[in-house]
């Protein structure tokens, strides 16, 4: 019976699907073999002959079982602000991620398309939310009783030292200066070491040495159908 034919190509039964690692070829109207990762369809199947697969050429790849006529091109070499975390092989695309001190301003399916340097909070401002792989640092003004005297993408606002006798009062960008007697560090509730939520106002009004958003960049992305992958149906 046709339903029991084990070898591709074969005509599927009504309502049935082609098996795993097979696809339905619209021209042949048959279930045919897909090509394995690292290969592509060199010759499509007919009613009497199965798909002929061939290896991907250098700098091209297929990651899934497929029947694409050409392998996909690996992405371009990683830029100077990136590190290559996965090399281009016949079975996988190159993956570039942002190097330390940078975050991904424009991601792609795997890895990053555009990296941007992490914002540095200037003196008087501390890190409210640390940067991640995909988000920039958020700065906040140092609250009364705290300061930051650095330009840094990691330093938070620290509490002023508490003096027995104050020589120079502390402000948002400078620690208090004490006279002769030994200072003690404040552990007051206002002295916050961990990142806190910031108000919209403080985010909008904070001065920053760098732009707070990445420059607007346009990219031409493919709009055609995605390459055939697993799970195609039969007749």
């Amino acid at each position: 019976l046709p339903a029991q034919v084990a070898f591709t190509p074969y005509a599927p039964e009504p309502g049935s699907t082609c098996r795993l690692r097979e696809y339905y070829d619209q021209t042949a109207q048959m279930c045919c073999s897909k090509c394995s990762p690292g290969q592509h369809a060199k010759v499509f199947c007919t009613k009497t002959s199965d798909t002929v697969c061939d290896s991907c050429e250098d700098s091209t790849y297929t990651q899934l079982w497929n029947w694409v006529p050409e392998c996909l091109s690996c992405g371009s070499r990683c830029s100077s602000d990136q590190v290559e975390t996965q090399a281009c092989t016949r079975e996988q695309n190159r993956i570039c991620t942002c190097r330390p001190g940078w975050y991904c301003a424009l991601s792609k399916q795997e890895g990053c398309r555009l990296c941007a340097p992490l914002r540095k909070c200037r003196p008087g401002f501390g890190v409210a939310r640390p940067g991640t792989e995909t988000s920039d640092v958020v700065c906040k003004p140092c609250a009364p009783g705290t300061f930051s005297n650095t330009t840094s993408s990691t330093d938070i606002c620290r509490p002023h030292q508490i003096c027995n006798v104050v020589a120079i009062p502390g402000n948002a960008s400078m620690d208090a200066v004490c006279t002769s007697t030994s200072p003690t560090r404040s552990m007051a509730p206002g002295a916050v070491h961990l990142p806190q939520p910031v108000s919209t106002r403080s985010q909008h009004t904070q001065p920053t040495p760098e732009p707070s958003t990445a420059p607007s960049t346009s990219f031409l992305l493919p709009m055609g159908p995605s390459p055939p992958a697993e799970g195609s149906t039969g007749d």
Partner: antibody, heavy 115, light 111 residues
Framework: QVQLVQSGSELKKPGASVKVSCKAS????????MSWVRQAPGQGLEWMGW????????TYAQGFTGRFVFSLDTSVSTAYLQISSLKAEDTAVYFC????????WGQGTLVTVSS | DIVLTQSPDSLAVSLGERATINCRAS??????????MHWYQQKPGQPPKLLIY???NLESGVPDRFSGSGSRTDFTLTISSLQAEDVAVYYC?????????FGGGTKVEIK
Amino acid sequence: QVQLVQSGSELKKPGASVKVSCKASGYTFTTFGMSWVRQAPGQGLEWMGWINTYSGVPTYAQGFTGRFVFSLDTSVSTAYLQISSLKAEDTAVYFCARRSNFAYWGQGTLVTVSS
Amino acid sequence: DIVLTQSPDSLAVSLGERATINCRASESVDSSGNSFMHWYQQKPGQPPKLLIYRASNLESGVPDRFSGSGSRTDFTLTISSLQAEDVAVYYCQQSNEDPWTFGGGTKVEIK
């Protein structure tokens, strides 16, 4: 279940154009091609060609090139047949039929060309 | 193109009797162990309805009084016991190669 639902009857004047739609449901639209078949009044069935619903590439049978255009809108699982510069001899019922190794058919669309 | 020749053009059969329709292809319609010949029934104002696919497979929901046989170039549709609702035109169709082609049709009537 597989269903192909076509647009309603059309009455057109010679020289006009018509666009017939065929909406598919009950299966993945881009898996199977779509054929178009013509049946003139009191006549048999004539295959016009087909369109690959994955690639969008049409194939036209002899006698159906030029004035006949197959197209798709995969977002709504619909195939289209457009006929331009209509002639009286284009009067027929037009069927869409799923291109598997046998066909599932739409209900047909009557196109009448008359002055 | 593969030419399909149906015979007879019309057929009058008594209720309950056997009706046989033949379809001959100008070249083989067999590939990969299958015969890509199908049979359809068409009633006035309706689309063709699939009865038999790939020469001998009965489509789901079709009464088992319909059967198909044959291979390569010669095929037969048989209605074992004609019923009133079987009055229609019957077409063979091949999908082994493009262009799809159809037989000229056989009109089945009650005698």
